[in-house]
């Protein structure tokens, strides 16, 4: 049993039928020695007397906010909640497995460029009776600070008889260095509590592997005298890195047509311009990836050829 | 190449060596999805890596107040990267193929030293510890982890260099 | 929490060959390399050699030609084996361990130590 | 061989006092592409194996009380005790890493006076 919060208690328990459960010992959190009951949530049921109450927790049953009162008053009170292990491995009930980038990847982590400020997400099916905490550090063994805010519900979606709920964070590194390499992964861990059950979901990585820029702004097209061809140009999305000399962007241009059988014509460039021929009902769409190091490219910006 | 002295390096062929080592880099290993590398035992090897750090003076600041801290900086990386893809854990079994861009990714790494390196001037001589004997089935995970470091390495250098060229250049 | 432990006669004829083994529990072999050091009775450490976590071997150029280290992975054990021993060779013998990496680190873990005199 | 050379050999310092042990290498143990320093420092006391202390010159083992701090680079390297304590008496060694064979000091006897 380990202390998540005051008064809140998470008892760790091997979940296997017939299996023994915890031992656990509450303590009243008061300087009375007599006269004290013990009552387990909205029941008035007596479940024992004296400043200590045991209990063997073996299932949801037991679990449950544990008050100890006198004479009709309310003294303290001590909630416990399970951590389910199943055959070793910790349950993960409350998130949803979003497969991207791989199995098991229930914390997916995006960053817009190098500040040390990042946005993770996550997806449930549960409604009610739903909390989230976060918590980040750089580093694990001696770690260096990350703020992050209160997790909230961004979207909602209907997926086929279900409705799915996805929840984000923002966090910002304390002491971010842009231009540094970096040599320890920021660790991002959020504690989720339904109803009960408590987990925990970790993610490991470095922003420059979560780097995925904003789209390219400003594009836009200006036709060549006599010619098929127009120059297009773009300029780096306000949210990138600065200076542009220094955290440079590639970019990639696309031609394509209105069918999507249509063959699309791609132009890698690191200028902010190029020159491509546009084909009538054609978009031409630009997206920017990092210069030097291969993370995400951007989601595309698009005008129409006409 | 760079003149001797404290002046600068050539900023342009340095810029565009970089900015190929960072291709050869991830040709030499493109990421396959996100690979976790965050097992047991990666801390020490990312640890024994070298890294620009935040106080190397390699951010645009740093470059413009004195460039030569970051860039023996960059120099030492070099070579102890060179060092590390020169030694039995590339060359050794199991062979990397034939047309592997690790030989290029070598030959560039000591090309671009050596634009650093400016004649008459010499940074202190580089010496590396004894590695650790590595066996075949060892060597493919850290051949992974210390190109995976790499690329990080070399997208800090590509951009000083870009930087540099770009507003540094006489 | 990793232990080392090792084992071997207390007592070896000089000319013979000194056997010892380090017993390891704790943790996965796989990730360790054992290194064997020594100490003469009030005098100071002395490095003998290593194997590492492939099975190779490194000693010391001073006791090359007499040593072999070796390792039995199903039994968690490495051996030491010291050939034609003299007085000189009657020491403390310890295993320590340091943690696989690049580069060979530090010994942070290390056996109780066992004292073998040679003597006829 | 690289030869680690400790000074002094024995030192004899009162409760409460601070203690310094120097460890000369040969040659230099910086790896300056990765910064490190490849010495470590140990403790040893009668009859037991000797403790890790400190390892990459100056970073402390966890669990070592922070009265030992280990400093110095390349040739030139000190283990400090701020504030003796009566456990401290013990025989410290300087051990390097960087190359075959591992070498170490001859060990310095730390006493109370």
């Known amino acids: 049993i380990w202390e998540l919060k005051k008064d809140v208690y998470v008892v760790e328990l091997d979940w296997y039928p017939d299996a023994p459960g915890e031992m656990v010992v509450l303590t009243c959190d008061t300087p009375e020695e007599d006269g004290i009951t013990w009552t387990l949530d909205q029941s008035s049921e007596v479940l024992g007397s004296g400043k200590t109450l045991t209990i063997q927790v073996k299932e949801f049953g037991d679990a449950g906010q544990y008050t100890c009162h006198k004479g009709g008053e309310v003294l303290s009170h001590s909630l416990l909640l399970l951590h389910k292990k199943e055959d070793g491995i910790w349950s993960t009930d409350i998130l949803k497995d979003q497969k991207e980038p791989k199995n098991k990847t229930f914390l997916r982590c995006e960053a817009k460029n190098y500040s040390g400020r990042f946005t993770c997400w996550w997806l449930t099916t549960i409604s009610t009776d739903l909390t989230f905490s976060v918590k980040s550090s750089r580093g694990s063994s001696d770690p260096q600070g990350v703020t992050c805010g209160a997790a909230t519900l961004s979207a909602e979606r209907v997926r086929g008889d279900n409705k799915e709920y996805e929840y984000s964070v923002e966090c910002q590194e304390d002491s971010a260095c842009p231009a540094a390499e970096e040599s320890l992964p920021i660790e991002v861990m959020v504690d989720a509590v339904h109803k009960l059950k408590y987990e925990n979901y970790t993610s490991s990585f470095f922003i420059r592997d979560i780097i995925k820029p904003d789209p390219p702004k400003n594009l836009q097209l200006k036709p060549l005298k006599n010619s098929r061809q127009v120059e297009v140009s773009w300029e780096y999305p306000d949210t990138w890195s600065t200076p542009h000399s220094y955290f440079s962007l590639t970019f990639c241009v696309q031609v394509q047509g209105k069918s999507k059988r249509e063959k699309k014509d791609r132009v890698f460039t690191d200028k902010t311009s190029a020159t491509v021929i546009c084909r009538k009902n054609a978009s031409i769409s630009v997206r920017a990836q990092d210069r030097y190091y291969s993370s995400s490219w951007s989601e595309w910006a698009s005008v129409p050829c006409s | 190449r760079a003149v001797p002295g404290g002046s600068s390096p050539a900023w342009t062929q340095c810029q565009q060596l970089s900015q190929k080592l960072c291709t050869l880099a991830w040709s030499a290993h493109p990421l396959v999805g996100h690979m976790d590398l965050r097992e047991e035992g990666d801390e020490e090897t990312t640890n024994d890596v070298p890294h620009i750090q935040c106080g190397d003076g390699c951010d645009p600041q740093g470059l413009r107040d004195n460039s030569q801290f970051c860039l023996q900086r960059i120099h030492q990386g070099l070579i102890f990267y060179e060092k590390l893809l020169g030694s039995d854990i590339f060359t050794g079994e199991p062979s990397l193929l034939p047309d592997s861009p690790v030989g290029q990714l070598h030959a560039s790494l000591l090309g671009l030293s050596q634009l650093l390196q400016p004649e008459g001037h010499h940074w202190e001589t580089q010496q590396i510890p004894s590695l650790s004997p590595s066996q075949p089935w060892q060597r493919l995970l850290l051949r992974f982890k210390i190109l995976r470091s790499l690329q990080a390495f070399v997208a800090v250098a590509a951009r000083v260099f870009a930087h540099g060229a770009a507003t540094l250049s006489p | 929490q990793v232990q080392l432990q090792e084992s071997g006669p207390g007592l070896v004829k000089p000319s013979e060959t000194l056997s010892l083994t380090c017993t390891v529990s704790?943790?996965?072999?796989?990730?360790?390399?054992v290194h064997w050091i020594r100490q003469p009775p009030g005098k100071g450490l002395e490095w003998i050699g290593v194997?590492?976590?492939?099975?190779?071997?490194d000693y010391n150029p001073s006791l090359k030609s007499r040593v072999t280290i070796s390792v039995d992975t199903s039994k968690n054990q490495f051996s030491l084996k010291l050939s034609s021993v003299t007085a000189a060779d009657t020491a403390v013998y310890y295993c320590?361990?340091?943690?696989?990496?690049?580069?060979?680190?530090?010994?942070?873990?290390w056996g109780q130590g066992t004292l073998v005199t040679v003597s006829s | 061989d690289i030869v680690m050379t400790q000074s002094p050999d024995s030192l004899a310092v009162s409760l409460g006092e601070r203690a310094t042990i120097n460890c000369k290498p040969s040659?230099?143990?910086?790896?300056?592409?990765?910064?490190?320093?490849?010495l470590a420092w140990y403790q040893q006391k009668p009859g037991q194996p000797p403790k890790l202390l400190i390892y990459?010159?100056?970073t402390r083992q966890s669990g070592v009380p922070d009265r030992f701090s280990g400093s110095g680079s390349g040739t030139d390297f000190t283990l400090t005790i701020s504030s003796l304590q009566a456990e401290d008496v013990a025989v410290y060694y300087c051990?390097?890493?960087?190359?075959?064979?591992?070498?170490f000091g001859q060990g310095t006897k730390l006493e109370i006076k």
């Open positions: 040659q230099s143990l910086l790896s300056s592409g990765n910064r490190k320093n490849y």
């Open positions: 990459y010159a100056s």
């Open positions: 704790g943790g996965s072999i796989s990730s360790y390399n």
């Open positions: 051990l390097q890493h960087f190359n075959y064979p591992w070498t």
């Open positions: 194997i590492w976590t492939g099975g190779s071997t």
């Open positions: 320590a361990r340091d943690k696989y990496g690049l580069f060979p680190g530090y010994f942070d873990y």
